[in-house]
Amino acid sequence: EPPTACREKQYLINSQCCSLCQPGQKLVSDCTEFTETECLPCGESEFLDTWNRETHCHQHKYCDPNLGLRVQQKGTSETDTICTCEEGWHCTSEACESCVLHRSCSPGFGVKQIATGVSDTICEPCPVGFFSNVSSAFEKCHPWTSCETKDLVVQQAGTNKTDVVCGPQDRLR
């Protein structure tokens, strides 16, 4: 009876279990009753990082110098190239597809530490009593306005993104 499931590192095709190609190799032809799976190594600048039945290898990532990228780790037949940014610049994401001078802290967050050549901006959430309503790479969280010191009262509570709104005290007639 033909199998309905195969072992690890195998795949089911034409009612039979064939071996997957190992990382660094692509599929040329499926196995048959009489022959093994045929695999070929990926070419220069190509890779496959899993046991697979792919008929094409993936191209290594290109670290575009026009985007500030350079090679951190050269790719192999089993691994993709890893890019990083030129010194003083920072990756926009884990995949490092482009570089920015420094990231900004979003509203609700303040700058804890300004970026340097080696470390990006460090942000921190604004605690109760403080707010930030801007995206910035240098502004800290600002304290809420003290209505009392202006002889006013709080008309609208502050949040981590907005200041309090002060207004006149209700005068008793």
Epitope: L67, G68, E86, S98, V100, S104, V134, A137, F138
Partner: nanobody, 116 residues
Framework: EVQLLESGGGLVQPGGSLRLSCAAS????????MWWVRQAPGKGLERVSA????????YYADSVKGRFTISRDNSKNTLYLQMNSLRAEDTAVYYC?????????RGQGTLVTVSS
């Protein structure tokens, strides 16, 4: 396309002054935080000064505090850096930058050389 054109650099003696300008185009200048950064020969990028979109809040690196003043004219789409009491260690290429600045958006910079 973002364009930032720095000017005003040159050779100046220690203790002298220079005013750098940065003409911005290709984006709404008044909406963006702006920065001056510099790169000395053989050194990394140093963040020198920054200003918020309205020009009401500023930042200065400790190395330039009290000597440099950042300002902006939103009606002219221009950023400025007034540099006084210049020192040899201020020698660098100065770049202006918007937030965020992608590598491909950077200007050519203007060279400031402080030497007697």
């Amino acid at each position: 396309e973002v364009q930032l054109l720095e000017s005003g650099g040159g050779l100046v003696q220690p203790g002298g002054s220079l005013r750098l300008s940065c003409a911005a185009s290709g984006f709404t200048f008044r909406d963006y935080e702006m920065w001056w950064v510099r790169q000395a020969p053989g050194k990394g990028l140093e963040r020198v000064s920054a200003i918020n979109p309205q020009g009401t809040r500023t930042y200065y690196a400790d190395s330039v505090k009290g000597r440099f003043t950042i300002s902006r004219d939103n009606s002219k789409n221009t950023l400025y850096l007034q540099m006084n009491s210049l020192r040899a260690e201020d020698t660098a290429v100065y770049y202006c930058a918007k937030l965020p600045t992608y590598f491909s958006d950077r200007g050519q910079g203007t060279l400031v050389t402080v030497s007697s």
